[in-house]
């Protein structure tokens, strides 16, 4: 005998009694597929999470992060604090990138400026906390007497901010 539960559509669940009637999901629960024997509890978007899509009887709520945080994980299961460009997140809060390192994102960590001299090039534009250096032509390509804008940037060694 075919399981009559399979006839219960999304938004309902199959009752446990012999008639196996389809019962609508109670408030704050949902079933996204047919034939479910129970409805799932709706996800609650609380704390640093905010509601992106409300829960319905057929689909779970979707969350994203409140302003000043960014999502991590499948379906935004985690929220991590943003920092400004030129900073990285540590346990003590957002810290400026150390000299010689930069971060052009609101998330992530500082990384060292490119060492133009490793490619035989010179520094065309200095690096900042928010931007990498811009490498220009090699010193040999410059006209006689010309020199690079600044001395070569430090080698790309990791920064040293506690985290």
């Amino acid at each position: 005998i075919q399981d009559s539960c399979s006839k219960c559509p999304a938004g309902t669940f199959c009752g446990k009694n012999k008639s196996q009637i389809c019962i609508p999901c109670p408030p704050n629960s949902f079933s996204s597929t047919s034939g479910q024997k129970a409805c799932d509890i709706c996800r609650q978007c609380e704390g640093v999470f905010r509601t992106k899509k409300v829960c319905s009887s057929t689909s779970n709520a979707e969350c994203d992060c409140i302003s000043g945080f960014h999502c991590l994980g499948a379906g935004c299961t985690m929220c991590e604090q943003d920092c400004k460009q030129g900073q990285e997140l540590t346990k003590k809060g957002c810290k400026d990138c150390c000299f010689g390192t930069f971060n052009d994102q609101k998330r992530g960590i500082c990384r060292p400026w490119t060492n133009c001299s490793l490619d035989g090039k010179s520094v065309l534009v200095n690096g900042t906390k928010e931007r990498d250096v811009v490498c220009g032509p090699s010193p040999a390509d410059l006209s006689p007497g010309a020199s690079s804008v600044t001395p070569p940037a430090p080698a790309r060694e990791p920064g040293h901010s506690p985290q």
Epitope: K91, Q105, I109, R111, S161
Partner: antibody, heavy 116, light 108 residues
Framework: QVQLVQSGAEVKKPGESLKISCKGS????????ISWVRQMPGKGLEWMGK????????NYSPSFQGQVTISADKSISTAYLQWSSLKASDTAMYYC?????????WGQGTLVTVSS | DIELTQPPSVSVAPGQTARISCSGD??????AHWYQQKPGQAPVVVIY???NRPSGIPERFSGSNSGNTATLTISGTQAEDEADYYC???????????FGGGTKLTVL
Amino acid sequence: QVQLVQSGAEVKKPGESLKISCKGSGYSFSTYWISWVRQMPGKGLEWMGKIYPGDSYTNYSPSFQGQVTISADKSISTAYLQWSSLKASDTAMYYCARGYGIFDYWGQGTLVTVSS
Amino acid sequence: DIELTQPPSVSVAPGQTARISCSGDNIGDQYAHWYQQKPGQAPVVVIYQDKNRPSGIPERFSGSNSGNTATLTISGTQAEDEADYYCATYTGFGSLAVFGGGTKLTVL
């Protein structure tokens, strides 16, 4: 949705070279760090190193510095882990993971077997 | 670079509380993260930034971190919690991530 898909299992002989891959999709591949993690048979997780695909900046765990090379091709959203000369002790499952501290997405793993 | 030390194994009866420690010099100065790994699967974050629980991870999982020890606590342990658990941290000094050696949790 975000996915990291790794290349298939490899069986190699000692001294051979190898390059395995990790293709990202569903997010801005260039702006998230990719880490590589080793798990030898029956053992724990070991962080090997990481790469920022946007500019291919890498840094390595001291234990793996000089033993492997991590690279990336942002045009095809793919990170790589390579060996120039494999040893039997390189036999392990290798995972790529998104992130540098919190690893929120993981590849399915690539099993590398090195045996004569 | 920091070394993280975990007990190789912890056993707990169903419904009881399991505590898994992760020791390292001044680990409390850095964020600790915890991963669960079941056989044949990739690891999954169960606690991040010392004490935050990702959505979808049961409330029985909690974490703390101060001084030289981070701790993962599983209250009312269930059979499905049997797995390997790894602590991890990221240190800005050298820009390195480190995993603990892992703890096999057995639910008796």
